[in-house]
C-alpha cells in the first residue's frame, strides 16, 4: 500500500497481495432480482445493463436463476464467497465462468453460479458440457 494511503484497523476494504499491491474489486452485473425469459437454454445473457464495482475486493459475481409456477427470475449481484448466499456456499467462486448448478429449494427450481472475472455473471451457463474444467 502506498504510504499516503491509510490502512485502517479491521479494514476489509483493502486487500493486498504478497507484494503489498492493492487488489481492485470485481466488476459484476448487478441488477438484483429481475424477471427473465431464460428457460430451457444451454446458456443465457443476463440482460442486465448495470455493471457495478463490487463494494469489497474479495466479492465475486453471482447469478441466481429461479423458476416457479408463476415466473422465472434472474438475480445478479456481488457477494463475499466466505459468506453463504441464499443459504448456500459459493463453491465455484474462483471459476472464470458462471456455471449454473442446481440447488435443492422446495417449491421451485433453483440454480446458482458464482465466478471471478469481470462481468462473468452476464453469461450464465446451464449446459453440462461446461461443467468439466474448461480453460476458456
Amino acid at each position: 500500500i502506498p504510504p499516503h494511503v491509510q490502512k485502517s484497523v479491521n479494514n476489509d476494504m483493502i486487500v493486498t497481495d504478497n507484494n503489498g499491491a492493492v487488489k481492485f474489486p470485481q466488476l459484476c452485473k448487478f441488477c438484483d432480482v429481475r424477471f427473465s425469459t431464460c428457460d430451457n437454454q444451454k446458456s443465457c445473457m443476463s440482460n442486465c445493463s448495470i455493471t457495478s464495482i463490487c463494494e469489497k475486493p474479495q466479492e465475486v459475481c453471482v447469478a441466481v436463476w429461479r423458476k416457479n409456477d408463476e415466473n422465472i427470475t434472474l438475480e445478479t449481484v456481488c457477494h463475499d464467497p466466505k459468506l453463504p448466499y441464499h443459504d448456500f456456499i459459493l463453491e465455484d467462486a474462483a471459476s472464470p465462468k458462471c456455471i449454473m448448478k442446481e440447488k435443492k429449494k422446495p417449491g421451485e427450481t433453483f440454480f446458482m453460479c458464482s465466478c471471478s472475472s469481470d462481468e462473468c455473471n452476464d453469461n450464465i451457463i446451464f449446459s453440462e458440457e461446461y461443467n468439466t474444467s474448461n480453460p476458456d
Epitope: 499491491a21 492493492v22 487488489k23 481492485f24 470485481q26 464495482i53 472475472s117 469481470d118
Partner: nanobody
C-alpha cells in the same frame, strides 16, 4: 517515472459540484484501465469509478451511480471525475490509480501506481 497528479479538490456545500483531474505521465496511458478511489477519514478505501483505456466504457460503485461521471482524454493523458449532487458522505481523499492489465481483467490484476490524492470536503 510513472506519475499521477490529482487536482480539483476543495470545500463544497452539499448539493454542489466539483471536477477532479488526474494528469498521468511516464506510461502509455491508452493501455490502462484507470480508476478513482477514495478514502474517507478513518475509513477504508472505496472504489468509486473506472474507465476502460479504449472505448470509454465506464463503471461505478452503487453509492455514486447517477451523480458522478468518469471520463478520460487520451490525447492529454488525463483522467476526470465530474461529481454532482455532492453529499457529506462523499468527503474523502480522492486518488487516481492505474491498473496492471491482467488476463481478461481477472481478479489477479492489481493497482500498481497511485497519485498523492486530492481532498474533497462536503460541508455547509
Amino acid at each position: 517515472e510513472v506519475q499521477l497528479l490529482e487536482s480539483g479538490g476543495g470545500l463544497v456545500q452539499p448539493g454542489g459540484s466539483l471536477r477532479l483531474s488526474c494528469a498521468a505521465s511516464g506510461f502509455t496511458f491508452t493501455e490502462y484501465r484507470m480508476w478513482w478511489v477514495r478514502q474517507a477519514p478513518g475509513k477504508g478505501l472505496e472504489w468509486v469509478s473506472a474507465i476502460e483505456p479504449i472505448g470509454n466504457r465506464t463503471y461505478y460503485a452503487n453509492s455514486v451511480r447517477g451523480r458522478f461521471t468518469i471520463s478520460r482524454d487520451n490525447s492529454k493523458n488525463t483522467l476526470y471525475l465530474q461529481m454532482n449532487s455532492l453529499r457529506a458522505e462523499d468527503t474523502a481523499v480522492y486518488y487516481c490509480a492505474k491498473q496492471i492489465p491482467g488476463r481478461k481483467w481477472t481478479a489477479n490484476s492489481r493497482f500498481d501506481y497511485w497519485g498523492q490524492g486530492t481532498l474533497v470536503t462536503v460541508s455547509s
